[in-house]
Amino acid sequence: LPAQVAFTPYAPEPGSTCRLREYYDQTAQMCCSKCSPGQHAKVFCTKTSDTVCDSCEDSTYTQLWNWVPECLSCGSRCSSDQVETQACTREQNRICTCRPGWYCALSKQEGCRLCAPLRKCRPGFGVARPGTETSDVVCKPCAPGTFSNTTSSTDICRPHQICNVVAIPGNASMDAVCTSTSPTRSMAPGAVHLPQPVSTRSQHTQPTPEPSTAPSTSFLLPMGPSPPAEGSTGD
């Protein structure tokens, strides 16, 4: 015969555990229902009645199946110099991240402890890997036949235009200049941009510095805001 499905609350068999989304209530000595995310235990179970759940109040949340008597308070509102990338709802805490053009150099459980500006690749260098919420831009020197003439955290190296007759050959930081006859092939005008990272959910992992063409010596252990321009010598 198939085993009967037990309805909460029920006394577990000796040595067995309660099922998924149930918990063992020490007082009632019964397996009882947990409350779903967005709810909390308003009344704990007894031997004869199951857990009574209620919705979290405004500005509070529970993210997991639970039997907590009160929902957790959402973090304080994001300050004016941060961006709210996840609103406070009954099921999730608010998450604040760095403003556009910055990344999280030292993360904390919800949000960021230290924001740093995204590295800008100087002329002769292009973006090899774009910045994200939690990692800096990685720059690379422009390979022969390509150039970047900007100081930017988004521009990649672009191919030199190909001339019928070259007036000035291109280099890593300057496009080729053609004589008055038009070039045989030309890139569209304007810099090529990589898309800015879209703020989604903050990742709760600590970034590690990427190798780059001019590594910063400013950080001795894994973290540290980057210099403002990759390969720059400073003042």
Epitope: L106, P117, S218, L221, P228
Partner: antibody, heavy 119, light 107 residues
Framework: QVQLVQSGAEVKKPGASVKVSCKAS????????IHWVRQAPGQGLEWMGW????????NYNEKFKDRVTMTRDTSISTAYMELSRLRSDDTAVYYC????????????WGQGTTVTVSS | DIVMTQSPDSLAVSLGERATINCKAS??????VAWYQQKPGQPPKLLIY???TRHTGVPDRFSGSGSGTDFTLTISSLQAEDVAVYYC?????????FGQGTKLEIK
């Protein structure tokens, strides 16, 4: 309320080391970065580096990195800054400071510790 | 390193008059500039951050402006308690650096 209380004045000879303490209260010590800033007599402010007590992450100003060590004792919510091989131009008031949010402008400061280096 | 240069080094202004202090960064720091007030024997006190955001409790006679490399702190109507040394600081990237200070006195 947030408070940073520093150790008392020190007089040291050139070549010696000094260790300044900064006791934090009014917040969770391991949740905020501590910075050290110094000010020579009649001079401006100079950032020496930051230290994160929660995981020992550290970032020293290049100017001081060979001589400065920042540490902490979480059991007593205290940060330390040790400067070695002292010279007369290290005579200054040394401040610990912290910032509330993730950007480095300092909304809380210790009262300062005067370090005098003299033979 | 980014060098922050303040002007003037000292300034004397009559009570009730406007005081203006300038700060120039040696390279673009976006709007990541803070201003502090320091009185003798005290640590600096944060007045303004992100160029123009007043810190909690700072009177509205203090205001800041600028972007890129040029920044200004303005006290619209000088009060006796505003006599102090004022410092700018960029909070853009390490190392964070301060201006040399501007001493503000009453004329």
């Amino acid at each position: 309320q947030v408070q940073l209380v520093q150790s008392g004045a020190e007089v040291k000879k050139p070549g010696a080391s000094v260790k300044v303490s900064c006791k934090a209260s009014g917040y969770t010590f391991t949740e905020s970065i501590i910075h050290w800033v110094r000010q020579a007599p009649g001079q401006g402010l100079e950032w020496m580096g930051w230290f994160y007590p929660g995981s020992d992450n550290i970032n020293y100003n290049e100017k001081f990195k060979d001589r400065v060590t920042m540490t902490r004792d979480t059991s007593i919510s205290t940060a330390y800054m040790e400067l070695s091989r002292l010279r007369s131009d290290d005579t200054a008031v040394y401040y610990c400071a912290r910032h509330e949010g993730p950007y480095v402008y300092f909304d809380y400061w210790g009262q300062g510790t005067t370090v005098t280096v003299s033979s | 390193d980014i060098v922050m240069t303040q002007s003037p080094d000292s300034l004397a202004v009559s009570l009730g008059e406007r005081a203006t202090i300038n700060c120039k960064a040696s390279q673009d720091v976006s709007t990541a500039v803070a201003w502090y007030q320091q009185k003798p024997g005290q640590p600096p006190k944060l007045l303004i951050y992100w160029t123009s955001t007043r810190h909690t409790g700072v009177p509205d006679r203090f205001s800041g402006s600028g972007s890129g490399t040029d920044f200004t702190l303005t006290i619209s109507s000088l009060q006796a308690e505003d006599v102090a040394v004022y410092y700018c600081q960029h909070h853009y990237s390490t190392p964070y650096t301060f201006g040399q200070g501007t001493k503000l006195e009453i004329k």
